[in-house]
């Protein structure tokens, strides 16, 4: 009886189970009753990452420097090229097809997580006791100055954007 289903890494064609081509190889001809599936390796700029019956290999992704992209990992016959963004830029999507500049955290916000080639800067509001008076992609919220440790007193309260202003204590006459 001709098979209706095939084993793993096989496919059904002409009532026969044929072996799939291994990753890194493409299908040249289906198997017959006399020959196994004929496969050929993908060329240097191509890949196939699964057991397959593809007659064409996929082209490696091109990391276009005009879009701010650079090669993170060179493709092989079994894997695609992985792109990442140049310094100061990050990917606009998971597939990393283009890059945009990292955003800066505005005054009143500090950097919670510094941007990478694949993720943007994550900002957080400065909590009470902390401030940020700059627009930055690197600086965290900084603690207010402790006037007491300097034998000074708070003359002006701090905000999320400004540090406290310390001054000398009033001397008793």
């Amino acid at each position: 009886e001709p098979p209706t289903a095939c084993r793993e890494k096989q496919y059904l064609i002409n009532s026969q189970c044929c072996s799939l081509c291994q990753p890194g190889q493409k299908l040249v001809s289906d198997c017959t009753e006399f020959t196994e599936t004929e496969c050929l390796p993908c060329s240097e700029s191509e890949f196939l990452d699964t057991w397959n019956r593809e007659t064409r290999c996929h082209q490696h992704k091109y990391c276009d420097p005009n879009l701010g992209l650079q090669v993170q990992q060179k493709g092989t016959s079994e894997t695609d090229t992985i792109c990442t963004c140049e310094e100061g830029l990050h990917c606009t999507s998971e597939s990393c097809e283009s890059c945009v500049p990292h955003r800066s955290c505005l005054p009143g916000f500090g950097v919670k997580q510094i941007a990478t080639g694949v993720s943007d800067t994550i900002c957080e509001p400065c909590p009470v006791g902390f401030f940020s008076n700059v627009s930055s992609a690197f600086e965290k919220c900084r603690p207010w100055t402790s006037c007491e440790t300097k034998d000074l007193v708070v003359q002006q309260a701090g905000t999320n954007k400004t540090d406290v202003v310390c001054g000398p204590q009033d001397r008793q006459r």
Epitope: T32, E33, E36
Partner: antibody, heavy 117, light 107 residues
């Protein structure tokens, strides 16, 4: 018991034709691909032709393509090899073989074809 | 066309000795290779399929190994009936091709 019995061999002049037959028994003939393999005197094995179980697909090496034709009659459990324009280099024992698991798992005893003037 | 080269052409050994026969393919054929034995005046018979798979009814002293381009048929301890010609055959692609054979003869 699987049996393959070839017949039709003999002495033939160059340029003439000959038809070999292979009677199969002991298995469901229509479920198997079949092939012809030959062996020139004192030489090695050479594949000559193959035919799929249903008879739709045939395969030949370049040196016999256009001259030899493989066919089968599943109702008669018989494999054929029609050989035309025979040459001296076609002189050989011709074996009928069954394709099982992509191997030639059973062979007939062979029939001798001699092409000579 | 895939060319199969068998070596040595002739192997002279005594019964009880180990025989190692080689078959080299002109390009990678994965494990798509069979081995056959032929005794004088007889038709060939299948010994090993898919490079290393044993055949029912074939003595366990016969074993095959290899993948890609280099294959080996090993007879662990030669019996008198093992002196014969051995052929490898590829079924990776058309045309089907055989090696030229290795004759194992009594020393």
């Amino acid at each position: 018991e699987v049996q393959l019995v070839e017949s039709g061999g003999g002495v033939v002049q160059p340029g003439r034709s000959l038809r070999l037959s292979c009677a199969a028994s002991g298995f469901t003939f229509s479920n198997y691909g079949m092939s012809w393999v030959r062996q020139a005197p004192g030489k090695g094995l050479e594949w000559v032709a193959s035919i799929s179980s249903g008879g739709d697909d045939t395969y030949y090496p370049d040196n016999v393509k256009g001259r030899f034709t493989i066919s089968r009659d599943n109702s008669k459990n018989t494999l054929y090899l029609q050989m035309n324009s025979l040459r001296a280099e076609d002189t050989a024992v011709y074996y009928c073989t069954r394709a099982g698991g992509k191997a030639m798992d059973y062979w007939g005893q062979g029939t001798l074809v001699t092409v000579s003037s | 066309e895939i060319v199969l080269t068998q070596s040595p052409a002739t192997l002279s050994l005594s019964p009880g000795e180990r025989a190692t026969l080689s078959c080299r393919a002109s390009q990678s054929i994965r494990d798509n290779l069979h081995w056959y034995q032929q005794k004088p005046g007889q038709a060939p018979r299948l010994l090993i399929y898919y490079a290393s798979q044993s055949i029912s009814g074939i003595p366990a002293r016969f074993s095959g190994s290899g993948s890609g381009t280099d294959f080996t048929l090993t007879i662990s301890s030669l019996e008198p009936e093992d002196f014969a010609v051995y052929y490898c055959q590829q079924f990776n692609s058309w045309p089907l091709t055989f090696g030229q054979g290795t004759k194992v003869e009594i020393k």
